[in-house]
Interface confidence: medium
Amino acid sequence: EAHKSEIAHRYNDLGEQHFKGLVLIAFSQYLQKCSYDEHAKLVQEVTDFAKTCVADESAANCDKSLHTLFGDKLCAIPNLRENYGELADCCTKQEPERNECFLQHKDDNPSLPPFERPEAEAMCTSFKENPTTFMGHYLHEVARRHPYFYAPELLYYAEQYNEILTQCCAEADKESCLTPKLDGVKEKALVSSVRQRMKCSSMQKFGERAFKAWAVARLSQTFPNADFAEITKLATDLTKVNKECCHGDLLECADDRAELAKYMCENQATISSKLQTCCDKPLLKKAHCLSEVEHDTMPADLPAIAADFVEDQEVCKNYAEAKDVFLGTFLYEYSRRHPDYSVSLLLRLAKKYEATLEKCCAEANPPACYGTVLAEFQPLVEEPKNLVKTNCDLYEKLGEYGFQNAILVRYTQKAPQVSTPTLVEAARNLGRVGTKCCTLPEDQRLPCVEDYLSAILNRVCLLHEKTPVSEHVTKCCSGSLVERRPCFSALTVDETYVPKEFKAETFTFHSDICTLPEKEKQIKKQTALAELVKHKPKATAEQLKTVMDDFAQFLDTCCKAADKDTCFSTEGPNLVTRCKDALA
C-alpha cells in the first residue's frame, strides 16, 4: 500500500533504534572515508526529520523518496570532491541515476587501516560510558569496510557484540572473557560479508532470475516438505529483500526481512517442522536463526526424479509451455532430494538439464536424446566430491596453516601476476574452509566447502576487476558464477608468466617480526612464500618446504637470541643465499 511519507512509514515500522542503525550503515557504506562523527551528525538530522514526518506526513519534503532524502544529505557534505573525487559527480545527476552512481562507487577494498580492537579495559570503559555511541562506532567501522554487508544482519552482530560486552565487562578477567567471544563474532561476520557480497554480485551481474534460482535451490534443500508454490513464494520474497539491500535500500530491506520472518513463523505448518525455536526469539535473532535453520527431515517415499523429468512423454511440451516454471520445479525436486549437494552444483545440474532439453526437444526423437541426462550428471557430481575429499585429506594432514600454504602455492602458480597481498588474503580465506567444513559430517561437507569457496573466489574476482592482471583470472571471473570454482580448480601453472627477479630485500627480515602477533607472523611468512613462487613458479613442493622450514628455523633462532638485531643482520643474508641455492 502507498504511504504519504515513506520515511515516516519506515520509522514507524522499524522503531528509532533500528532506523538510526540502518541509516548509519547506509551512509557508512556509501561514503566510506567519512568519520563516525560526520555520519552520526547526518543520522541525527535524518532521524529528527523522520520524526517531524511521523507527526505530520504532509510536512515539507516528507513525501520525497528515501533515495532523494539520503542522496541530498550525502551531497550536502562539505569537501565532497576533495575527499571522494569523481564520486562527487554523482551529485549532478537526478534520482534514480544518482543512487546508481553512488552504488558504482562503492569500494570493495577501501584503503582503511585494519579494524583494531582496543584493550579490554579501554573497551569496557567506553562501552559503559556510552553504549549507543560505542555500538555506533562498531556499525560504522564494519559498514565502511564492507559496503555490501547485509544491513539487518549487521544489526544482529552489533546486538551480539553488545551482549558480550555487557556480560564480560562485569567479569574480573575481562580479556579472557572477551577475546574468544569477540573472535567468534568477527569470524562469523566476515563469512557473512563474503556470502552477502556473492549474492549482490549474482544480482548485479546476472539479475533477479539468477538470484531467485539460487534461492529456490537453497530453500528447497532446507524445507523439503514445503510445496513448490510455497518455495516459489519464499524465493520471490527473499529475492526482493536481497535486491533492496544490495541496492542500498536498507530500510525497505530490513522491513521486508522482518515481514518475511513473520510470514514464515505464521506458516510453519506448510514450511518446516524446525522453525519453532527460531520463531520464539526476538526479531533480529529470529531472522538470523531462520537464515541458518537446520534442514527439515526429507519426506519418505519421494518418487524418482526421472518420473516427471525424463520418463514422462510430455517433457518437451511441458518445457516449451512454461520454461521457467518447469525448470523451477526440476530445481525444486532435485534440490529437496539433495541436501548433501552444494547450491552451486544444483544450479550446474539445472543448467545442464536446460541445455539438454534445448538441444533434444529440437530433434526428431527427443526422449531418446534426453533419456540419458541423469547419467550425464555423474561427472558434474563427482568433480566437487573429489575436490572435497582431496582437500579435506590435505587439511587433515597439514592443519590450517599448512593447508593455507599449500593453497597459496597452488594459486600463485595459477595466477602469479596477482598482487601478493591479494594472493595471501585469498589463500588464508580459502584455507579456512578446512576448519570450517572438513570437520562436519560427510553429508554436510560438500555444500559447506563449495559454497564457501565460491564466495571467497567471488571476492578474488571483485579485487581483480579493479586491476586486471591475469588472463587466467579474467577467464574464470567472466563466466557464470556457478562455473567459477570449477574453472579456478582446473587452472594449472601459468606458462605465459615471466618469473620475477630475485630481490634480496623481499626476503630480508628484522627483529620487529618477533613481537608481532601469531597471525601477523604467519602473513609475513606467507608473503615470502608467495614471492618465492613468483620467483620460481615451477619449484617443487619439496624445494619450497626446505626453504620454508629453513626460514621458520631462522626466525625461531633469532627471536630467541639475546641480541636479536645482530642475529637478523648476520644470519639473514646467509638465509637468502641458502634459499637461492635451494631453488637453483
Epitope: 514445503a226 510445496d227 513448490f228 510455497e230 516427471d308 509451455e321 518447469f326 525436486e333
Partner: nanobody
Framework: AVQLVDSGGGLVQPGGSLRLSCAAS????????MSWVRQYPGKEPEWVSS????????RYADSVKGRFSISRDNAKNTLYLQMNSLKPEDTAEYYC?????????RTQGTQVTVSS
C-alpha cells in the same frame, strides 16, 4: 503468483463419498503433474495419488487403491479427487500439490471427516 485453492471437504458417514477440487492459477497447469496429499494431526504429510500433465497416467497409494480416483480438467485449471467407500481412517486434511511428490502445501487444505 502460483496459487492453489482446495475445496469439497466435509463430514461424511463411513461408506459415503466426497469429491475434492483444487483450483490452480499463476502457472501453466496442463504442463505439470499434480498430486493429492493428506495430513493427519501432528503427523508428516502422506502421498495419496498423482496424475501427469496430460491426465492419462494416474498413481495411487495402496491404502486408497480402488476407492479413490484422481482426474483433471486442464481447460478449467482444476484437479479433482473422487473419494468413494470412505473409512474413518481417511479422516485428515487433504490438499493438492504441484508435481508428483509429498510436500506440505501452502493452501489451507480441505478437512475430510469420516464418522458415524
Amino acid at each position: 503468483a502460483v496459487q492453489l485453492v482446495d475445496s469439497g471437504g466435509g463430514l461424511v458417514q463411513p461408506g459415503g463419498s466426497l469429491r475434492l477440487s483444487c483450483a490452480a492459477s499463476g502457472f501453466s497447469f496442463g504442463s505439470f503433474g499434480m498430486s493429492w496429499v493428506r495430513q493427519y494431526p501432528g503427523k508428516e504429510p502422506e502421498w495419496v495419488s498423482s496424475i501427469n500433465g496430460r491426465g492419462d497416467d494416474t498413481r495411487y497409494a495402496d491404502s486408497v487403491k480402488g476407492r479413490f480416483s484422481i482426474s483433471r480438467d486442464n481447460a478449467k485449471n482444476t484437479l479433482y479427487l473422487q473419494m468413494n467407500s470412505l473409512k474413518p481412517e481417511d479422516t485428515a486434511e487433504y490438499y493438492c500439490t504441484i508435481g508428483r511428490s509429498v510436500s506440505r502445501s501452502r493452501t489451507q487444505g480441505t478437512q475430510v471427516t469420516v464418522s458415524s
